[in-house]
């Protein structure tokens, strides 16, 4: 997260970390007992590393009593995801057992009506991305407020030309923004899952480039296919 | 030091327009949400509107979407507000306003306010 | 659009009492709330935001607390330059409504 500041520990309980060989990769999102949403993306710089989900955590490195490590039973990226592409850029984890659930696990609603949302609402992203552009790591969670952006000018010739689907949102990127290690993470409006980081290799923190979230309500259907 | 500066308002007729401008100093212009609050004489404070960091999205209040415009110069750090159909109802006192920068609707430095009244 | 309803409309109170004034929003707004003050003939003043953060230089007789849709703004001690007019908004997105404020006199 660029320009983000630290979260209030254990206030976004549905946070999760998404872990290839006890590294964090990429950011999820716990939408059930059992499954954590991110994106499709994060498997490719998985290799064959062994992918595992942490749940209940502020700090990465730190012992915290809500912390829970979790393996995955199951990997199902969206079947329409491609590697060169960011459409339909979702991936669901079956963790191995239920989560045992608390004030700092938990599941976060998603939005299943399939309406825009307004532009210039504000939203909350949050991760353990980069927190600069030389690439620095933060230990503790960080967060950042977006106001959403308008599709038709996220699609100007000058921002990002056209490349926006209707299953696809952005919020605004100046100095502010998710960044690398932020992908699969949630968008969330008034406490609603709404949009998930895309993984591409996108700018940060420019505002010609504004970031580009996944609309989960454009794949409720999918969702619940899997989640069933 | 944060400084934001509107120009001179003043009396104008119903059906006509009106240019206002805010001239800001001791911040990095393009940094920032700016807006346009207004307040009726002895009444509360109603936001007008409000324009993101390179003036490429505006938000206005839905009564005045029609009539009201907020653009802004980053090269000459001013904020604008163009009224047009003025009606006697938009008589106020019209503040331009930063946007705090993390909160983005909080203001956290106001101008001093200029005044406009819409009577024949 | 989301309503904030203040109370009271007005207040007596003496120098070195402890006033609190509440905002309601008709709607869960979170944590999104800002409090301004207002003197007579002058533009306002952001006092508190994200509900009980203080604006630089407000001094700390000021607190904002509560979330969703219940909120107050607390002033212990009051001094002769706290009087004057206090208003709350939401600014948890568009549009951001102000409540119809709060009138604080010297008693």
């Known amino acids: 997260i660029l320009g983000g500041r630290e979260a209030e520990a254990h206030a976004r309980p549905y946070m999760a970390s998404v872990q290839v060989n006890g590294e964090h990769l990429c950011g999820g999102v716990l939408v059930a007992e059992q499954w954590v949403l991110s994106a499709a993306h994060c498997l490719e710089d998985a290799a064959d590393g062994k992918v595992q989900v942490l749940l209940g955590a502020h700090s990465l490195s730190q012992p915290e009593p809500s912390k829970r490590l979790y393996d995955v039973l199951r990997a199902v990226p969206h079947p329409d995801s491609r590697p060169d592409t960011i459409d339909h850029d979702l991936l669901l984890l079956q963790l191995s057992e239920k989560a045992t659930l608390g004030p700092a696990v938990r599941p976060l609603p998603w939005q299943r009506v399939d309406r825009d949302v307004e532009p210039g609402t504000l939203c909350d992203v949050a991760g353990w991305g980069i927190v600069s552009h030389a690439g620095r790591r933060p230990d503790r969670l960080q967060h950042v407020l977006l106001p959403v952006l308008d599709r038709a000018t996220c699609n100007r010739r000058t921002h990002h030309d056209g490349a926006i689907t209707q299953r696809m949102m952005c919020a605004e990127s100046n100095r502010r923004d998710s960044c690398k290690g932020d992908s699969g993470g949630p968008l969330v409006c008034g406490g609603v899952l709404e949009g998930v980081v895309t993984s591409g290799s996108r700018v940060c923190g420019n505002r010609k480039k504004p970031g580009i979230y996944t609309r989960v309500a454009s794949y409720a259907a999918w969702i619940d296919s899997v989640l069933a | 030091e944060v400084k934001l500066v509107e120009s001179e308002g003043g009396l104008v007729q119903p059906g006509s327009s009106m240019k206002l401008s805010c001239t800001a100093s001791?911040?990095?212009?393009?940094?920032?949400?700016m807006a346009w609050v207004r307040q009726v004489p002895e009444k509360g404070l109603e936001w007008v509107g409000n324009?993101?960091?390179?003036?490429?999205?505006?938000y206005y209040l839905d009564s005045l979407k029609s009539r009201f415009i907020i653009s802004r110069d980053s090269a000459k750090n001013i904020l604008y507000l163009q009224m047009s159909s003025l009606k006697s109802e938009d008589t106020a006192t019209y503040f331009c306003?930063?946007?705090?920068?993390?909160?983005?609707?909080?203001?956290?430095?106001w101008g001093q306010g200029t005044s406009v009244t819409v009577s024949s | 659009d989301i309503q904030m309803t203040q109370s009271p409309a007005s207040l007596s109170a003496s120098v070195g009492e402890t006033v609190t004034i509440t905002c309601r929003a008709s709607?869960?707004?979170?944590?999104?709330l800002a409090w301004y003050q207002q003197k007579q003939g002058k533009s306002p003043q952001l006092i508190v935001y994200?509900?009980?953060t203080l604006a630089e230089g407000v001094p700390s007789r000021f607190s904002g607390s509560g979330s969703g849709t219940q909120f107050s703004l607390k002033i212990n001690s009051l001094q002769p330059e706290d009087f004057g007019s206090y208003y709350c908004?939401?600014?948890?997105?568009?549009?951001?409504?102000f409540g119809g404020g709060t009138k604080l006199e010297i008693k």
């Open positions: 306003a930063r946007g705090e920068d993390f909160y983005l609707y909080a203001m956290d430095y």
């Open positions: 001791g911040f990095t212009f393009s940094d920032y949400y």
């Open positions: 324009i993101n960091y390179d003036g490429s999205s505006t």
């Open positions: 709607e869960n707004i979170h944590s999104y």
């Open positions: 994200n509900t009980k």
């Open positions: 908004q939401h600014h948890y997105g568009i549009p951001p409504t």
